[in-house]
């Protein structure tokens, strides 16, 4: 909501999760792994990479089925705590200028840092309009105090807020699982909010920094190349 059409393939780590239709976003973090939101879980997912217009075959797409879909063991569907999911692709993505991985964070998100949020979610706060072309939004990371004040009692240490307390610009339905990137690192995963782009109701995002070890351990445990000592 309140964003702009991204330059074509300017978000090369952005993926679309498809089950006959786009239902969530995700981020490519290695040639064979995608991270998304826990509440995007489905038993069958096709991962679509290199997309810009999801309704048109433009020639840069790679469609790869999910081989493994692993939700965080402590995911809570009621509170959306630990809202993170890993998808192993059935075959590695071909990395090129339009499809490439995003780095995991080396430090937690800092208040005031500019970030890029992207997705094919709803662009209306009152109503629904699902775009064909990838939308981008530049938004600041909010302080944990502002975040907790916006959603008293609902924000865990695994969540943070990004956006504008005045409303008007936000992620929305269909954006879940998609990236929040600051300084070339995947800091957040689109998770939840009260409505979209409402005043004093900024978007809430999964804090990827808290899951770097889980991500690395899960990838290692699900690799065909285990090294037993």
């Amino acid at each position: 909501v309140g964003g702009y059409i991204c330059e074509e393939n300017s978000v090369p780590y952005q993926v679309s999760l498809n089950s006959g239709y786009h239902f969530c976003g995700g981020s490519l973090i290695s040639e064979q792994w995608v991270v998304s939101a826990g509440h995007c879980y489905k038993s069958r997912i096709q991962v679509r990479l290199g997309e810009h217009n999801i309704e048109v075959l433009e020639g840069n797409e790679q469609f790869i089925n999910a081989a493994k879909i692993i939700r965080h063991p402590k995911y809570n569907s009621r509170t959306l705590d630990n809202d993170i999911l890993l998808i192993k692709l059935s075959s590695p993505a071909v990395i090129n200028s339009r499809v490439s991985a995003i780095s995991l964070p080396t430090a937690p998100p800092a208040a005031g840092t500019e970030s890029l949020i992207s997705g094919w979610g709803n662009t209306l706060s009152s109503g629904a309009d699902y775009p064909d072309e990838l939308q981008c939004l530049d938004a600041p990371v909010l302080s944990q105090a502002e975040c907790e004040a916006s959603y008293p009692g609902k924000i865990t240490n695994n969540m943070f807020c990004v956006g504008f307390l005045e409303g008007g610009k936000d992620s929305c339905q269909g954006d879940a699982g998609g990236p929040v990137v600051s300084n070339g690192e995947l800091q957040g995963i689109v998770s939840w909010g009260y409505g979209c782009a409402q005043k004093n109701r900024p978007g809430v995002y999964t804090k990827v920094y808290n899951y770097v070890d889980w991500i690395k351990d899960t990838i290692a445990a699900n690799s065909h190349h285990h090294h037993h000592h």
Partner: antibody, heavy 127, light 108 residues
């Protein structure tokens, strides 16, 4: 149980206004969008607009823009639809309908629908 | 505006037979399509949402399928209480939120 109870039938003169109420019970009123749909005698369903009971934000069908006003009173869990400058072709049954799925949801693409409807309010416009 | 077109306008079926109702959208609505049943003098009742998910309390003889622009409501074995008007509705792009014109299922 979850229900929507609408105000009673109205008979109005052309040019007048009508205000229909829809009282919600059995759920958190501010968690669900409320829509208004009308049905002229022997005709299909026609969407008029919607209100977000939490923020008061509205969205109206272009056809009714400038003639319809949707409001809510959260203290009594009631939504209102006022239609002004009534004409004879506004004669219809007016329904309020709740959208299933609470407002505080994850941001996955979610299918929506009207899971609960009011009983309808017949509005007759006649000189 | 997304235009929803239902066919046929009237469907004559004998009790116990299968009924297949069609709904076409003028552009893709993903899976955001609902089906309602309406009987004379009553408010509509939700049958199917998300194109294929049965609403609470709806019998298994009602099923929905399709995505994008083509959708189908199937009633596997018509009961006497199923004779009614059926409407499809898209929730993918609004305002305006749009309904199909309805299909009347009548006794043959």
């Amino acid at each position: 149980q979850v229900q929507l109870v609408q105000s009673g039938a109205e008979v109005k003169k052309p040019g007048a206004s009508v205000k229909v109420s829809c009282k919600a019970s059995g759920y958190t009123f501010t968690d669900h969008y409320m829509h208004w749909v009308r049905q002229a005698p022997g005709q299909g369903l026609e969407w008029m607009g919607a209100i977000n009971p939490s923020s008061g934000g509205t969205a109206y069908a272009q056809k009714f823009q400038g003639r319809v006003t949707m409001t809510r009173d959260t203290s009594i869990s009631t939504a209102y639809m006022e239609l002004s400058r009534l004409r004879s072709d506004d004669t219809a049954v007016y329904y309020c309908a709740r959208v299933g799925g609470a407002a505080r949801v994850g941001k996955a693409y979610t299918a929506s629908a009207f899971d609960i409807w009011g009983q309808g309010t017949m509005v007759t416009v006649s000189s | 505006e997304i235009v929803m077109t239902q066919s046929p306008a009237t469907l004559s079926v004998s009790p116990g037979e299968r009924a297949t109702l069609s709904c076409r959208a003028s552009q893709s609505v993903g899976s955001n399509l609902a089906w309602y049943q309406q009987k004379p003098g009553q408010a509509p009742r939700l049958l199917i949402y998300g194109a294929s998910t049965r609403a609470t309390g709806i019998p298994a003889r009602f099923s929905g399928s399709g995505s994008g622009t083509e959708f189908t409501l199937t009633i596997s074995s018509l009961q006497s209480e199923d004779f009614a008007v059926y409407y499809c509705q898209q929730f993918h792009n609004w305002p305006p939120l749009t309904f199909g014109g309805g299909t009347k299922v009548e006794i043959k």
